[in-house]
């Protein structure tokens, strides 16, 4: 059994006689020989569903859930309730109704098993018959609406009539109506004005039933018409087994460059036209097992369950259904020497499915595991400036398919030809297993004889030990000139153009910084800075050389404070900054401000405090002080 | 009608162990939390601890927290007291009590055993 | 924790007079209180909780007022069968707490 609505309405006025009819509440049958039977919960309770009194006023026939007004309600008995309110004012209460024999606890009240009923009070007696508007003769304040399971026998889930205006206004005439389109399974009784289901609702046809309800009041020698909505919901039983949508069940798939743990190998599409068991339950009542092959596959592989709701047409109005993606995952990184081939089976079982017909369904993996040769190119050769900096990026090298490679461990390694001319290093790129070239020696690329670098680049896979090896030609280019005095260590430090490019600093490849212009547009990424180099730096990612030292690149690498318009970037650096951003890495510190103030305003600024607010620059408010400002002149 | 029966009280020495159950019927024991509460001779009320309806959460006096442990099996409509490392001031009358709880409220107790008298003494 | 603390701790009274017992709590406990009797040998029995909800079978004279931290229990009419020890408990918080009790005597 269950109540066809979970919460119902009705008006309450002061001393409404006793024997007032109230409403009915029903319920529908969810087996044939049910019989309900109806029992009102202990209490009454106000806002905020606290207790205010035991309920002695308001009685429940137990067989046919009509309620009815057992004694009135006095207005000293409504101020007792008042006062129990925990200090809100009282404008409903409402009550529990139970379907006997029922699981739940009394302390709780959810649907199917229990319904509220409010009651809105009135401090005044039921009004004169005839100032009552053709609205309140005809239906209650709060709309009501309706759930109806699936596959249940029909029965009678409302009554149309308000039967206290019924039982204080019997002169006045209301029929009721049901505004619906041929073939639909719903039935008004004229005489009863009860509204019953013809025959058991299927959901997968169709889930919402939007009606209409026509009320016309006679008073008289006047007829007056009322419409409300009508809306019914039918709610979802497991009674849909899954399927494989265009009869699909089987998935291939070739594991090469991708190795990582939690890649996705494969994925199969199970259809089921149901939306029950709901999200909370769905993986453990939706069960898949990866049927037990060898060792090394049930090692290797699992399966993940991700169900989604999705909506399908049916006769013309759309229902929701549920699609669940059932992926192949790797459950450890695989070494680049394995190379099998397999065949995995997954059963999908669909527990709460009765049938008929089974709720299990086998989907089919073919895998094929790769091996992975590692490849450089037979040489490489590229350019490196004199004047190049400590920690300046040079170039790449990569083995064939690294953009590709995740969980592929491959580092790099350089073998100098020249001992005195070892200049540069190498360390490999987590981001696509490539190795960044980087100047590590500045003395030896100043040695007039180390004009021609020679190395052998060597890229290992330490898990298997498997080796590919280039040729590295590095020409050295152009002519050392020394820095200015005075220039500091990164060049993140200048804030202005033309300090800027008039120094060097770490990470710098042609011994000068580089000036980017940003775009002026608020807190932006693209904000104004001075780097060792644009094409790295800032770039909103710390990469694997700048981690070497954090005056190469602080805009991307710094973990300490930001003072300024700014958003800070995940984990470290300035994701986005206002105007120009310049930083002092022994400082931990960067600074982000408009880019327009000239000195002589900076000067004035400085003996004051400046406040860069929140609606000036979009981003957190900062306060800059004195302290902070002497930076700006840095030079 | 409704009724909680204590049971397993005595005579025990300091810090020996004792059980004590509380057998409860007439209602759906399943739907409520339980409470102990103690009342030493000649003394006030005392709350001991209480669980939660299914089980699954549980809360103790400071005075008797990680010595005592509460526990109950709905399938007997049993609820249950495990009192380990006692003391002479656990020396007490011990009752079981049905906690009223409504719709997220708690409302005390409601119905009450009459209490299984321990003794800790040497 | 939250302490409760229960005045008088005895009162002598006669049949027919008004008794108000109060109970203080250490910080408001938003109603969360309720009043039990308790009789020589017997179990305590819950006269009123939420502040001021009459437990069903329980006289009329019994009342309870109060919120935040000041909670009274009153009886209006004292009869010969309210002679008794009379509890407060707060069931805001865990862990519950009592008062101290009241007793109410025979002047």
């Known amino acids: 059994l269950y109540f066809s609505r979970d919460a119902y309405w009705e008006k309450l006025y002061v001393d409404q006689p006793a024997g007032t009819p109230l409403l009915y509440v029903h319920a529908l049958r969810d087996a044939p020989e049910e019989v309900p039977s109806f029992r009102l919960g202990q209490h009454l309770y106000g806002t905020y569903r606290t207790r205010l009194h035991e309920n002695n006023w308001i009685c429940i026939q137990e067989d046919t859930g009509l309620l009815y007004l057992n004694r009135s309600l006095d207005r000293s008995s409504w101020e007792k309730l008042s006062g129990r309110n925990r200090g809100f004012p009282l404008l409903t209460v409402y009550l529990k109704v139970f379907l006997s024999p029922t699981s739940l606890r009394e302390g709780e009240c959810q649907w199917p098993g229990c319904a509220r009923v409010y009651f809105s009070f009135f401090n005044t007696s039921f009004p004169a018959c005839t100032s009552l508007k053709p609205r309140e003769l005809c239906f209650p304040e709060t709309r009501p609406s309706f759930r109806i399971r699936e596959n249940r026998p029909p029965g009678t889930f409302h009554q149309f009539r308000l039967l206290p205006v019924q039982f204080l206004c019997p002169n006045i005439s209301v029929a009721y109506r049901l505004l619906e389109g041929e073939g639909l399974p719903f039935r008004c009784a004229p005489d009863s004005l009860e509204v019953s289901t013809r025959w058991a609702l299927d959901r997968e046809q169709r889930e919402k039933y939007e009606l209409v309800a026509v009320c016309t009041v006679h008073a008289g020698a006047r007829e007056e018409v009322v419409m409300v909505p009508f809306p019914v919901t039918v709610y979802d039983e497991d009674d849909s087994a899954p399927t494989f949508p265009a009869g699909v069940d089987t998935a291939s798939a070739v594991v090469e460059f991708k190795r990582k743990e939690d890649t996705v190998v494969a994925t199969l599409r199970v259809f089921d036209a149901d939306v029950v068991p709901a999200s909370g339950e769905l993986v453990r009542r939706y069960t898949s097992t990866l049927l037990p092959g060898d060792t090394w596959t049930q090692q290797t592989f699992r399966v993940e369950h991700w169900p989604n709701e999705t909506s399908v047409q049916a006769n013309g109005s759309f229902v929701r259904a549920t699609v669940h993606d059932y992926r192949l995952v790797l459950n450890r990184n695989l070494s680049i020497s394995e190379n099998r081939t397999m065949q995995l089976a997954v059963l999908v079982n669909d527990s709460d499915f009765q049938g008929p017909g089974a709720g299990v369904l086998l989907l089919h993996f073919n895998v094929s595991v790769l091996p992975v040769s590692l490849h450089l190119p037979s040489s490489y050769s590229l350019s490196v400036s004199r004047r190049a900096r400590r920690f300046a990026q040079i170039g790449k090298v990569c083995v064939e398919n690294c953009q590709a490679f995740s969980g592929i461990n491959v580092q790099y390694e350089l073998h100098s030809s020249g001992a005195n001319c070892s200049t540069l290093g190498v360390v490999t790129s987590a981001e696509d297993t490539s190795g960044i070239l980087f100047v590590n020696d500045t003395k030896a690329l100043r040695r007039p004889k180390c004009a021609e670098l020679h190395y052998m680049v060597v890229a290992t896979n330490h898990q298997t030990s498997r080796q590919a090896q280039a040729q590295l030609l590095v020409t050295v280019e152009g002519l050392y000139v020394a820095e200015e005095a005075g220039c500091p260590l990164s060049c993140a430090v200048s804030k202005r153009r033309p300090e800027c490019e008039e120094c060097g600093g770490l990470g710098s490849p042609t011994g000068r910084c580089e000036w980017r212009q940003g775009d002026g547009k608020g807190i932006t990424r693209n904000f104004s800075t001075c780097s060792p180099s644009t094409k790295t730096c800032p770039d909103g990612h710390c990469d694997v050389v700048e981690t070497q030292d954090i005056n190469i690149c602080p805009q991307d690498c710094l973990r300490g404070s930001i003072v300024g318009g700014h958003e800070p970037g995940e984990p470290r650096g300035i994701k986005a900054g206002y105007g120009t951003c310049n930083c002092f890495p022994e400082e931990e510190k960067c600074f982000c401000e408009p880019e327009d103030i000239q000195d002589p305003l900076c000067d004035e600024l400085c003996r004051e405090q400046k406040l860069i607010s929140e609606e000036d620059l979009g981003g957190e408010q900062k306060l800059i002080s004195e302290e902070d400002l002497h930076h700006h002149h840095h030079h | 009608q409704v009724q909680l029966v204590e049971s397993g009280g005595g005579v025990v020495q300091p810090g020996r162990s004792l059980r004590l159950s509380c057998a409860a019927s007439g209602f759906s024991f399943s739907s409520y939390g339980m409470h102990w509460v103690r009342q030493a001779p000649g003394k006030g009320l005392e709350w001991v601890a209480v669980m939660w309806y299914d089980g699954s959460n549980e809360y103790y006096a400071d005075s008797v927290k990680g010595r005592f442990i509460i526990s109950r099996d709905n399938s007997k409509s049993t609820l249950y007291l495990e009192m380990n490392s006692l003391r002479a001031e656990d020396t007490a009358l011990y009752y079981c009590a049905r906690e009223d709880w409504d719709e997220g409220y708690y409302y005390g107790m409601d119905v009450w055993g009459q209490g299984t008298t321990v003794t800790v003494s040497s | 924790d939250i302490q409760m603390t229960q005045s008088p701790s005895s009162l002598f009274a006669s049949v027919g007079d008004r008794v108000t017992i109060t109970c203080r709590a250490s910080?408001?406990?938003?109603?969360?209180l309720g009043w039990y009797q308790q009789k020589p040998g017997k179990a305590p029995k819950r006269l009123i909780y939420a502040s001021s909800i009459l437990e069903s079978g329980v006289p009329s004279r019994f009342s309870g007022s109060g919120s935040g931290t000041e909670y009274t229990l009153t009886i209006s009419t004292l009869q010969s069968e309210d002679f008794a020890i009379y509890y407060c408990?707060?069931?805001?918080?865990?862990?519950?707490?009592f008062g101290q009790g009241t007793k109410v005597e025979i002047k």
């Open positions: 408990l707060q069931h805001n918080s865990f862990p519950w707490t």
């Open positions: 910080q408001d406990i938003r109603y969360d």
